[in-house]
């Protein structure tokens, strides 16, 4: 496969601690700044449930235990999940809403059990998109998908 630069990248896997919080940072390329960004849950793309979506501005949007904030200057949007539960473990997507062809990348979320009673200050972990923006056939790493309102892969080496 010829190397293709993906339009959106995110961490392949993130790990949180039960009752703590985790932060995922997804990076997008130039041109997508003003588009809506979202965080969706479910491995089957077309049936994944959007948990939170930006309003098109940089203002933080929060719904239940999940928040999303877009930094258009840095072309990064940040998703935070708080008060984590074991049942939060699943396949999620960082995505950008675009008519006809959404952009998205899968993020696998795992939750480790809290070994001690709930801390007074919840544990917080941040995960950022990998620096690599290009994939080659020698590296079988998923860094980005291009979606057509269901699974639509742009590049998987």
């Amino acid at each position: 496969d010829a190397s293709i630069v993906t339009q959106i990248t995110g961490p392949t896997t993130v790990n949180g601690l039960e009752r703590g919080s985790l932060t995922v940072q997804c990076v997008y390329r130039s041109g997508w700044e003003t588009y809506l960004k979202w965080w969706c849950r479910g491995a089957i793309w077309r049936d994944c449930k959007i948990l939170v979506k930006t309003s098109g501005s940089e203002q933080e949007v929060k719904r239940d235990r999940v928040s999303i904030k877009d930094n258009q200057k840095n072309r990064t949007f940040t998703v935070t999940m708080e008060d984590l539960m074991k049942t939060d473990a699943d396949t999620y997507w960082c995505g950008i809403e675009k008519t006809g062809n959404d952009l998205g990348v899968t993020v696998q979320v795992t939750i480790d059990p809290a070994s001690t009673p709930a801390p007074t200050t919840p544990t917080s972990t941040t995960f950022t998109a990998p620096v690599t923006q290009e994939e080659t056939s020698s590296s079988p790493t998923l860094t980005g998908h291009h979606l057509d309102n269901r699974h639509k892969l742009l590049k998987l080496s």
């Epitope: 077309r46 396949t91 998923l142 998908h145 269901r150 639509k152 892969l153 998987l156």
Partner: antibody, heavy 119, light 112 residues
Framework: QIQLVQSGPELEKPGETVKISCKAS????????MHWVKQAPGKGLKWMGW????????TYADDFKGRFAFSLETSASTAYLQINNLKNEDMATYFC????????????WGQGTTLTVSS | DVLMTQTPLSLPVSLGDQASISCRSS???????????LEWYLQKPGQSPKLLIY???NRFSGVPDRFSGSGSGTDFTLKISRVEAEDLGVYYC?????????FGGGTKLEIK
């Protein structure tokens, strides 16, 4: 190239258990859910459900809840379909299938595993 | 469950003829995201099914342009403009909009 290779034909008695394998190659196994499809002799196709190949969480169509179990051996890039307490109506060819992001359809299929149930 | 009904059950054709297969769903298969996940598969004897059309009218890569899909809501059609010998087999429509996903009963395309 991407391949899904299934285990060979099975001959089992009613009441027994069978486990069919589907070994994936040519792609990162945990990035794509695996689906299972049943085809009874001379009949059409029936979607059985799928398994999240990262988390191992299965989803079953109503007709396949109970005696059917999807599982994984991630280190071997292999998905399994186990059928317990076999019945005559389980006699069929079972396919594993991968849905591709781009195609919006099942564009990679295993070759099928024929299960014969006979006393 | 969404019932997918295909007609005809069997379709005898001469090579070079046009063939048309109908698929009707028992309810609308427009997904909540606005897309219609209607696919067509061809299964030849002793083989696995092969994807022809996805999302009603999109030809999968490598599928000849003599295959075309159309329709909306509950009524869908697969057309083969000039049937070739390699097109013979059983055609299935499939809806992936509502769980459980369901296949049609199949249409056997055979030589007249």
């Amino acid at each position: 190239q991407i391949q899904l290779v299934q285990s060979g034909p099975e001959l089992e008695k009613p009441g027994e258990t069978v486990k069919i394998s589907c070994k994936a190659s040519g792609y990162t196994f945990t990035n794509y859910p695996m689906h299972w499809v049943k085809q009874a002799p001379g009949k059409g196709l029936k979607w059985m459900g799928w398994i999240n190949t990262y988390s191992g969480v299965p989803t079953y169509a109503d007709d396949f809840k109970g005696r059917f179990a999807f599982s994984l051996e991630t280190s071997a890039s292999t998905a399994y379909l186990q059928i317990n307490n076999l019945k005559n109506e389980d006699m069929a060819t079972y396919f594993c299938a991968r849905m591709d992001y781009y195609s919006n359809g099942f564009n990679y299929w295993g070759q099928g595993t024929t299960l014969t149930v006979s006393s | 469950d969404v019932l997918m009904t295909q007609t005809p059950l069997s379709l005898p054709v001469s090579l070079g003829d046009q063939a048309s297969i109908s698929c009707r769903s028992s309810q609308s298969i427009v997904h909540s995201n606005g897309n219609t996940y209607l696919e067509w598969y061809l299964q030849k004897p002793g083989q696995s099914p092969k994807l022809l059309i996805y999302k009603v009218s999109n030809r999968f890569s490598g599928v000849p342009d003599r295959f075309s899909g159309s329709g909306s809501g509950t009524d869908f059609t697969l057309k083969i403009s000039r049937v070739e010998a390699e097109d013979l087999g059983v055609y299935y429509c499939f809806q992936g909009s509502h769980v459980p996903w369901t296949f049609g009963g199949g249409t056997k395309l055979e030589i007249k």
